[in-house]
Interface confidence: low
């Protein structure tokens, strides 16, 4: 009933709760002397479904047959309308439309841990839209029964609050769930199980790892489990990996030796437990243990390269470079690099530990046969040394690779190609492709990059430390025993016209011609490899086209003579620079008048 219904009643037949698709009869009747004040014939009873009129009738009562009501609750309200007054609410009723419960499916029960309680879940089936009561019943040996009810409209879980014990692990228990509402009832199929079937162990806890003698090869994982656990499965992976390694163990008694861990790697470990070989279910995975394995002696050898620079008639500078070992080779934190320099004939040797750098420079005599050995050391030991004989890498002209070219290959890549040397190509043991940013001053501090290529390769894609709009000096070395030959080329991955022209800093007269000197364009304005400089000149105040002279670009060159100027004529001169993409704007303009010989 909706309110006090003082003026009348609303009755619903056959029931306020009906099956979907059923018809109901709704009657609204006024109580005596509750109609309109003067004329009862003027009583107009109106039936509303929610806020919508569905029927009306003049008199003391109204009958309405209603069909097609939707699932859920529908509100009907009866109102009285008299002449010259507002409608008055008489009474109302809610009708509940639903269905009988379906048979609960997939009843399954579980006890979490040996000390836990039995709880069951099931699938309710489609929503009844009605208040539905679920009763869960468990029967066990010796006619023991337990029962639990839940009256939640969405009930699909109940905990009995009882603990099954392992005294008779093979004893059978049967669970059944029954759903009841106003329109009917239905029971699940019974589910029969034993203690071993339904106890799901708690996940292992207190997980720890021990490395005997700080060695990764002697590693034991420890954990604690409930007393009846028979099986464990372990999973572990490096923290930066998505793939797990899995191990199944029986009767582990809370410990297991792991034999395949990598050194100096952070791992994540998890363990799960089970009570019986083929009964019951696995526990949840334990909380993760994260642990870093100890270091081991480095494996692998450093990739070492070098550069020689002439200082004077008796001395040369040797710069050694090496690449970091990969993480899997370093097997720990590299504390220092050990560099040994040895004169092979006299036996003099010098050893130095280098920390924080992957290069070393020293000055040695130009005479003698020199060799270096470089190794990497962590807390557990050193890698095998890489040995290199210092030789003149470009001495053997017949070993020089031919037709070296460098072409842009996509973003920040350069494809270097070459032809084998004229000398027996089969003598080549390996090629080394070296590249560094081109600096006009030949700066030895510029980082050096290199890669090694097998003797049958005639190309290499260089991508490490390659920037757009920067020119690189690229050398290809062919190595054979104690000999080497080399060829070089300039290359860039991306280029455009230079941003500025060279700055003329001086014009001097020499024997009837002039010498123009200029400052190099700053590297960041060259926008790639320069191919040419152009020197332009024209008579001052003349409208004629300027003359020009084009000079191939050479790193070291910053002056050039011009001998076609007329004496005692004032000229304006300027310069530009060109890359493969185009010509720069003008550099500064300078005026000059060639004096010539006096008559």
């Amino acid at each position: 009933k909706i309110d006090a219904c003082k003026r009348g009643d609303v009755t619903v037949k056959p029931s306020h709760v009906i099956l979907l698709g059923s018809t109901v009869n709704i009657t609204c009747s006024l109580k005596p002397r509750q109609g309109c004040f003067h004329y009862s014939r003027r009583n107009k009873l109106i039936l509303y479904k929610f806020d919508r009129r569905i029927n009306f009738h003049h008199g003391h009562s109204l009958n309405s047959q209603v069909t097609g009501l939707p699932l859920g609750t529908t509100l009907f309200v009866c109102k009285l309308a008299c002449i010259n007054s507002d409608e008055i609410q008489i009474c109302g009723a809610e009708i509940f439309v639903g269905v009988a419960p379906e048979q609960p499916q997939n009843l399954s029960c579980i006890q979490k841990g040996e000390q836990g309680t039995v709880a069951c879940t099931w699938e309710r089936g489609r929503d009844t839209h009605l208040y539905t009561e679920y009763t869960l019943q468990l029967s066990g040996p010796k006619n023991l029964t337990w029962q639990k009810q839940c009256k939640d409209i969405y009930c699909d879980y109940l905990d009995f609050g009882i603990n099954l014990t392992p005294e008779s692990p093979e004893s059978n228990f049967t669970a059944k769930v029954t759903a009841v509402n106003s329109l009917g009832s239905s029971s699940s199929l019974p589910s029969t199980f034993t203690f071993l079937d339904i106890v799901r162990p708690l996940p292992p806890w207190d997980i720890r790892i021990k490395f005997q003698k700080a060695s990764v090869s002697r590693c034991t994982l420890y954990w604690r489990d409930e007393g009846l656990v028979l099986l464990n499965r372990l999973r572990y992976r490096p923290s930066n990996s998505r793939l797990w390694n899995m191990v199944n163990v029986t009767k582990a008694k809370g410990r297991h030796d792991l034999l395949d861990l990598k050194p100096f790697t952070e791992y994540e470990f998890q363990i799960s437990s089970k009570l019986h070989l083929y009964k019951g279910s696995w526990s949840d995975w334990s909380e993760s243990l994260r642990a870093q394995t100890p270091e081991e002696e480095p494996t692998g050898m450093l990739d070492v390269w070098y550069m020689k620079r002439h200082i004077d008639y008796s001395r040369q500078q040797i710069s050694l470079f090496w690449k970091n070992l990969s993480v899997s080779e370093a097997r720990g934190k590299i504390l220092h690099y050990q560099v040994t320099l040895q004169e092979l004939t006299g036996g003099k040797a010098m050893t130095q530990n280098i920390t924080g750098h992957t290069s070393w420079t020293t000055v040695i005599p130009r005479t003698g046969n020199w060799a270096v050995a470089v190794s990497a050391a962590n807390s557990k030991g050193s890698s095998l040394p890489t040995r290199i004989n210092i030789m003149n890498l470009c001495e053997a002209g017949l070993l020089a690779p031919r037709q070296v070219s460098a072409n842009s290959e996509g973003m920040d890549n350069i494809l270097v190609t070459w032809q084998p040397p004229r000398k027996d190509p089969s003598a080549v043991q390996e090629y080394v492709v070296e590249w560094r940013e081109l600096h006009p001053g030949g700066d030895t501090q510029v980082p050096l990059n290199w890669l090694r290529s097998r003797p049958y390769n005639v190309s290499a894609l260089i991508s490490e430390n390659i920037k757009s709009y920067i020119c690189y000096e690229i050398r290809v070395y062919a190595l054979s025993g104690d000999q080497g030959g080399c060829s070089s080329i300039l290359g860039n991955s991306k280029h455009k016209a230079p941003l500025s022209g060279p700055h003329i800093n001086a014009i001097t007269e020499e024997k009837g011609s002039i010498l123009i000197s200029w400052n190099s364009i700053p590297v960041q304005e060259q926008m790639g490899c320069l191919l040419h400089y152009r020197i332009y000149w024209k008579e001052r105040d003349s409208n004629s086209q300027p003359q020009l002279c084009e000079i191939p670009y050479r790193v070291s060159q910053n002056s050039h003579p011009i001998n076609s100027l007329q004496p005692r004529v004032t000229y304006v001169l300027w310069m530009t620079a060109l890359t493969a993409a185009g010509e720069s704007s003008h550099g500064n303009e300078r005026e000059f008048c060639l004096q010539g010989k006096a008559n």
Epitope: A291, Q292, P294, S379
Partner: nanobody, 125 residues
Framework: EVQLVESGGGLVQPGGSLRLSCAVS????????IAWFRQTPGHEREGLSS????????FYADSVKGRFSISRDNAKNMVYLQMNSLKPEDTAVYTC??????????????????WGQGTQVTVSS
Amino acid sequence: EVQLVESGGGLVQPGGSLRLSCAVSGFTSDYYVIAWFRQTPGHEREGLSSIRIGDSATFYADSVKGRFSISRDNAKNMVYLQMNSLKPEDTAVYTCAGRYDTLLGGGRPREFPYWGQGTQVTVSS
């Protein structure tokens, strides 16, 4: 012989900050963990945060995540616990503890063989 000595406790107002220090000596390898625990009368020790000395990896219990921060200074052999936004319920005796091996997690008190003497922290207005 391993020794741990705490300092830095005291009285602080709610919302205030405090930095506890743990001076560490005697460990013979880098494979060890220092953790901070706290205990109030009648309650078990609660693990708050730990740091692995080899690589400074850290762990925090949910109760202090975002408020407390653990750090180390290898040169001085010190481990610090910076405590911000302190609440009255943070009042306790704070103790640092140590153990060999590389396990990081919060850990239970019985897993730590080496303990300091503790320092009192009182949060009250």
